[in-house]
C-alpha cells in the first residue's frame, strides 16, 4: 500500500481466484483513543472499532472510503483504491491500446519543435468517474524538471457502437536547451483512476524522436508564363525552432489528381519553393520534416491547381 495523495491510498493486489488479498492497517487521524467506530462508504453498517483497524482487501467491495467516527461525528477518512496485477502484469483496463507505433502503446506524444514543449494524448471508452494526473521528468535517477498542465478532454469520436474519448496534456521542460544533444530521455507518467480502480501508464522518449513539425504555411502558386508549370512556394511554420539555418527542414511536394488512383508526382527539396506541373483538377500539397533527423513528417498543406 502507498499514498497517492493526502488520505488516498493505493492497494496493490495479485488478482486471481481465491487470492488472499492484502492486510491493510488504517489509523484514525485523531487524538481520540476510545469510542471510535469505522464504516465503509455510505453504509451505516459498522465494520469495526478502535483507533487502528486491520482490514483484508481482496476485491473492489473492499475498496472505497473508510471513515472513522465518534459519537456521530466524523473524525477522518481514508480512500482505498485497487491496483490489479494479473499474471505478474499490471492491469491496463482504463486506456485503449493505440497500437501505433507498436502494440501496448497507451500514451502518444508529439513535439512541434525543440523548445522542450510537447503534447501527450491517450484514448478511453470510459466517460464518467475518471481522473488523470500527469508527471514528467528528464531522466529518472536524478530527474530534471518538466512541468505538465492538467489533462483535458480534447476530442470525442464515435467508433462503431462505442464512443471514444481523447484526453491530452501539455508539458514543458523547465530548463530546455533546444540545440543540445539529448542523452537522457523524457519520462511521462500518467495516473488514471476510474471509480476505485487505479492504473498507471508510462512513456519514455527523446524530444528528437517525437518531433512532428506543423505544416508549411503560406503555400502559394505562381503560374509560369507559356507553361503548364507553376512555382510553388511556402514558408517554415511559425512554431518551428529558430534559427532556421540551424533547425532546418526538408520538404516533400506532391501533385495529386482528383482520383486517389491517379499517379502522384513527388519532389523532395530543402528549399522553400519548387517548380511542378499543375494538372487540371489536381492539388498541390507540401509537408515538412526535420532535415537532419528522420522523425515524423508534418501533415500536408494543400492548395488546388485551378
Amino acid at each position: 500500500i502507498w499514498e497517492l495523495k493526502k488520505d488516498v491510498y493505493v492497494v496493490e493486489l495479485d488478482w486471481y481466484p481465491d487470492a488472499p488479498g492484502e492486510m491493510v492497517v488504517l489509523t484514525c487521524d485523531t487524538p481520540e483513543e476510545d469510542g471510535i467506530t469505522w464504516t465503509l462508504d455510505q453504509s451505516s453498517e459498522v465494520l469495526g472499532s478502535g483507533k487502528t483497524l486491520t482490514i483484508q482487501v481482496k476485491e473492489f467491495g473492499d475498496a472505497g472510503q473508510y471513515t472513522c467516527h465518534k459519537g456521530g461525528e466524523v473524525l477522518s477518512h481514508s480512500l482505498l483504491l485497487l491496483h490489479k496485477k494479473e499474471d505478474g502484469i499490471w492491469s491496463t483496463d482504463i486506456l485503449k491500446d493505440q497500437k501505433e507505433p507498436k502494440n501496448k502503446t497507451f500514451l502518444r506524444c508529439e513535439a512541434k519543435n525543440y523548445s522542450g514543449r510537447f503534447t501527450c494524448w491517450w484514448l478511453t471508452t470510459i466517460s464518467t468517474d475518471l481522473t488523470f494526473s500527469v508527471k514528467s521528468s528528464r531522466g529518472s535517477s536524478d530527474p530534471q524538471g518538466v512541468t505538465c498542465g492538467a489533462a483535458t478532454l480534447s476530442a470525442e469520436r464515435v467508433r462503431g457502437d462505442n464512443k471514444e474519448y481523447e484526453y491530452s496534456v501539455e508539458c514543458q521542460e523547465d530548463s530546455a536547451c533546444p540545440a543540445a544533444e539529448e542523452s537522457l530521455p523524457i519520462e511521462v507518467m500518467v495516473d488514471a483512476v476510474h471509480k476505485l480502480k487505479y492504473e498507471n501508464y508510462t512513456s519514455s522518449f527523446f524530444i528528437r524522436d517525437i518531433i512532428k513539425p506543423d505544416p508549411p504555411k503560406n503555400l502559394q502558386l505562381k503560374p509560369l508564363k507559356n507553361s503548364r508549370q507553376v512555382e510553388v512556394s511556402w514558408e517554415y511554420p511559425d512554431t518551428w525552432s529558430t534559427p532556421h539555418s540551424y533547425f532546418s527542414l526538408t520538404f516533400c511536394v506532391q501533385v495529386q489528381g482528383k482520383s486517389k488512383r491517379e499517379k502522384k508526382d513527388r519532389v523532395f527539396t530543402d528549399k522553400t519553393s519548387a517548380t511542378v506541373i499543375c494538372r487540371k483538377n489536381a492539388s498541390i500539397s507540401v509537408r515538412a520534416q526535420d532535415r537532419y533527423y528522420s522523425s515524423s513528417w508534418s501533415e500536408w498543406a494543400s492548395v488546388p491547381c485551378s
Epitope: 453498517e45 482490514i55 481482496k58 467491495g61 473492499d62
Partner: nanobody, 115 residues
Framework: EVQLVESGGGLVQPGGSLRLSCAAS????????MYWFRQAPGKGHEWVST????????AYADFVKGRFTISRDNAKNTLYLQMNSLKPEDTALYYC????????RGQGTQVTVSS
C-alpha cells in the same frame, strides 16, 4: 427462529490455540456481515473481528495483531474464530453477532488463558 450458538471455548495455556465456532440457524451467514465480540470479566464488550459478504473479506481489532483468523463455512452456515498465540489478557466470554448492535447474538463461549 433466528439463532446463534457458540462453542469451542475452554481453558488453554498461554501460547496455545483454540477454534471457536458459531452455528447459525434461521438465516444465511453468507448474506450478512458477521462479527465476533468478547467481554472480559468486569469490562465492557469489545469488538474482535468482522467477516463481510461477497468474497468474505475480513477486519480485525488492533489487539489481534495477526493472531486470530475469522472465517466461515457457508455450507454449514457456521462462523469460526481461530485463535493462536493466546495471552492471559484474551480471557473473556466470546460471542458472535449478526449486527454491530448485537440484536442477534449468541450466549457466548468462555475462553480462559492461564498457566
Amino acid at each position: 427462529e433466528v439463532q446463534l450458538v457458540e462453542s469451542g471455548g475452554g481453558l488453554v495455556q498461554p501460547g496455545g490455540s483454540l477454534r471457536l465456532s458459531c452455528a447459525a440457524s434461521g438465516f444465511s451467514i453468507s448474506n450478512n456481515w458477521m462479527y465476533w465480540f468478547r467481554q472480559a470479566p468486569g469490562k465492557g464488550h469489545e469488538w474482535v473481528s468482522t467477516i463481510k459478504t461477497g468474497a468474505g473479506s475480513t477486519a480485525y481489532a488492533d489487539f489481534v495483531k495477526g493472531r486470530f483468523t475469522i472465517s466461515r463455512d457457508n455450507a454449514k452456515n457456521t462462523l469460526y474464530l481461530q485463535m493462536n498465540s493466546l495471552k492471559p489478557e484474551d480471557t473473556a466470554l466470546y460471542y458472535c453477532a449478526r449486527d454491530w448492535a448485537g440484536t442477534v447474538r449468541g450466549q457466548g463461549t468462555q475462553v480462559t488463558v492461564s498457566s
